[in-house]
Interface confidence: low
């Protein structure tokens, strides 16, 4: 057994540039030739245990064989030189690992950052992958002094081991080196103070002002290298539920500061704030954002009164009536605070008044048949809204003036209502709506619109294929005008069932068919027309179309003594639905006729 290898491969540590050619040689020792009775022609080259084709191999002399590879692309190849001893037994002589890759690119985009409280970190773009072990060294020096090299672990960044010295320029560059070459980046020259990224401001607090409901005061603590740097700020805020931030103009926060008053905010609204800082010259990097802090602006009196309406309940007799005053809770944007209660004042025409404090959104009062004026104001802890005023006329007064050209139509999944105003100046409009049903009472919802509005959409949660009865009432200073109503659908569908047809009268050659209107709950839309299909057991089917206003129809030119099958369908704008089939037989003779 030979302890010494039988030969060697040269080069022993081959590194090849990808895409280039490469030649290796295997030199056998003289002792080996004699021991195994071989020469170089017995050499078998293998890559990753697979024999290399003969055409790539050249026998140079009795001890030496070469192998040539063109366009090397594999990152790593096990190359072995083997001999066929005694003509058949394969014996390994020597093996090497052949690596391929690229020389390093010149590093680019070299940038450095000094995170406050940490050493300087520099980053660069190393360029294309080398596929080889490549060392990246960050070098830095003053004009007169070199700093310790920084050996990069990842090849794209390095944090220097020394603390930065501010207000003195430093030169920094990167050297990249591997088995195929060595290259340096362009150097950059800067003062580390201009590369500082401050730590985020902290202890951000938000306070409101009782005097001004539109402001919030911010205060915070800045670091800035322990006061070494003057910092300017960037302040952003949003309402609690919003996803987008509002920017305080940067020119307002350019000077170094640790407090700021944000203006033009909405009353009684929660805002979330965040702040970051940078060197006041604008050089360096913005800090990360501070932790968010929130605050709520102070309440302001409600900006408008609630929508206000009333309904007269069935009369208790001649002496008095029960009136239910109803109103809508103000949206937050108008309430400007927590509504504590509502103040309702009812004034009789003789100047007798009664004040009620109500926490809910309705109040039922008993009134005589005189005219009353009702006023309603919403109250929060700052004050009261302006009053909404309603005149409740005597029940003996007939309402005059109503809207004209009332229309309703669906659009964009909303039910729109439009009208032409009456000729007399209006204070506001009340829209009321409910689902028409034979199975349940018409439970009304309502909304109020300003006097300038003559087109709006219903703001309730409407259901498809339900018939809505919509009423529009103009309200004047003297009280409500006349009400106009119509029916509308948010979205129609085909009817749930078709009509059930029956015969009202059957003659020898004609039959009067009758049917009931489909209940409104099953209509699912406006019934536009009916179709009547009729046939005999052997005859062709006949179809007649009937207007939706009819509930009977006479079939004529029928054959006597014949069984007829009849079916009706009802159609909305969205399709039709058949009713059940019905059969009848015409008599053989007309009344009074004999054979």
């Amino acid at each position: 057994q030979l302890l010494e290898p039988c030969g060697y491969i040269y080069p022993e540590f081959p590194v090849v540039q990808r895409g280039s050619n490469f030649t290796a040689i295997c030199v056998l020792k003289e002792a080996c030739l004699q021991h195994y009775y071989v020469n170089a022609s017995y050499i078998v080259w293998k890559t990753n245990h697979a024999a290399v084709p003969r055409e790539q191999v050249t026998v140079i002399n009795r001890t030496t064989s070469s192998v040539t590879f063109t366009d090397v692309v594999l990152p790593s190849v096990q190359l072995t030189c083997n001999i066929l001893s005694f003509g058949q037994i394969e014996q390994n002589v020597y093996g090497v690992t052949m690596l391929s890759g690229f020389p390093p690119d010149k590093p680019t985009n070299l940038t450095c950052i000094v995170n406050e409280g940490k050493n300087m970190l520099c980053q660069w773009d190393p360029g294309r992958e080398t596929y080889l072990e490549t060392n990246y060294t960050l070098k830095s020096e003053w004009a007169t002094e070199k700093f310790p090299d920084c050996q990069s672990k990842h090849g794209t960044s390095c944090m220097v081991s020394y603390m930065p010295t501010y207000y003195v320029n430093i030169e920094v560059w990167v050297e990249a080196e591997n088995a195929l070459g060595k290259v340096s980046s362009e150097s950059i020259n800067f003062d580390p103070v201009d590369k500082v990224k401050p730590t985020p401001p902290y202890n951000l607090s938000v306070t409101n002002s009782e005097e001004l409901s539109s402001i919030l005061k911010l205060s915070w603590v800045s670091s800035g290298l322990g006061g070494l740097l003057d910092l300017k700020s960037d302040i952003q805020y949003r309402t609690k539920d919003a996803s987008t931030w509002i920017q305080v103009p940067l020119e307002d926060t350019m000077s170094p500061r640790t407090s700021f008053t944000v203006q033009d905010l909405k009353p009684f609204t929660e805002y979330v704030f965040r702040i970051r800082s940078i060197k006041d010259s604008g050089k360096g990097y913005w800090s990360d954002w501070s932790e968010e802090a929130s605050g709520t602006t102070y309440e302001d009196r409600p900006s408008r009164p609630p929508s206000f309406w009333y309904k007269t309940n069935p009369s208790h007799g001649q002496e008095y009536r029960s009136v239910r005053l109803i109103w809508k809770a103000l949206p937050l944007s108008e309430a400007n605070g927590k509504i504590l209660d509502y103040e309702v004042i009812l004034t009789q025409s003789k100047s007798v008044s009664q004040t009620y404090t109500v926490t809910g959104t309705e109040l039922t009062v008993n009134l005589t048949n005189d005219r009353y004026v009702a006023s309603l104001a919403a109250r929060n802890k700052v004050g009261k809204s302006a009053a909404a005023v309603l005149t409740i006329p005597s029940p003996h007064v007939t309402a005059a003036y109503s809207v004209v050209n009332l229309k309703a139509f669906p659009k964009d999944n909303l039910l729109w209502v439009e009208w032409t105003p009456p000729p007399k100046p209006v204070s506001k409009y009340i829209l009321e709506w409910c689902v028409l049903s034979e199975n349940a009472p018409c439970v009304e919802d309502w909304q109020q619109e300003d006097a300038t509005v003559n087109r709006t959409h219903l703001r309730g949660r409407l259901l498809e294929s339900k018939c809505y009865q919509i009423t529009v009432t103009p309200v004047f200073a003297t009280g409500p005008g006349g009400s106009e109503s119509l029916k509308a659908y948010l979205k129609q569908a085909a009817p749930a069932r078709g009509p059930t047809v029956r015969t009202k009268k059957v003659g020898k050659n004609e039959a009067v068919l009758a049917w009931d209107q489909i209940p409104v709950d099953d209509q699912n839309g406006f019934i536009r027309n009916y179709s009547i299909s009729y046939r005999t057991s052997v005859g062709k089917e006949m179809v007649v179309h009937v207007d939706s206003s009819h509930t009977e129809y006479t079939l004529s030119s029928l054959s006597s003594d014949t069984l007829y099958m009849v079916r009706m369908a009802a159609y909305t704008d969205e399709g039709g639905k058949d009713g059940p089939e019905f059969t009848f037989t015409t008599p053989k003779f007309a009344q009074g006729e004999i054979e």
Partner: nanobody
């Protein structure tokens, strides 16, 4: 999963007191108002009292006004019914109910979507 769990029922002598509790859980959004109902065997379930979970405003059935008080502890997600001066006719199964209908607080049974299993109150002479 929405759950309402009543507790605190039991037997008491006329003129006595009981305090019912109702724990609520599983709501994505809290109910608009919570109510207490009672049912005597063979009779319709009737509204006793209700409280708005937002403003705390409440309504009562005439038969319990001045004797019963409904309250809530938002932090514990619990609604209570304090019953004083109990009468024989207050006997029945008491149910806690929750409504998500956005309307004024009410003891209208039809406005309630979620119901508890009930707790028995028995008033004896």
């Amino acid at each position: 999963q929405v759950q309402l769990q009543e507790s605190g029922g039991g037997s008491v002598q006329a003129g006595g007191s009981l305090r019912l509790s109702c724990g609520i859980s599983g709501f994505t959004y809290r109910p608009t108002f919570m109510g207490w109902f009672r049912q005597v065997l063979g009779k319709e379930r009737e509204g006793v009292a209700a409280i708005s979970t937002g403003g705390g405003s409440s309504v009562y059935a005439d038969s319990v006004k001045g004797r019963f008080t409904v309250s809530q502890d938002s932090s514990k997600n619990t609604v209570y019914l304090e019953m004083n001066g109990l009468k024989l006719e207050d006997t029945g199964m008491y149910y806690c109910a929750a409504s998500t209908v956005i309307t004024s607080v009410s003891i209208n049974r039809g406005l309630y979507q979620y119901w508890g299993q009930g707790t028995q109150v028995t008033v004896s002479s």
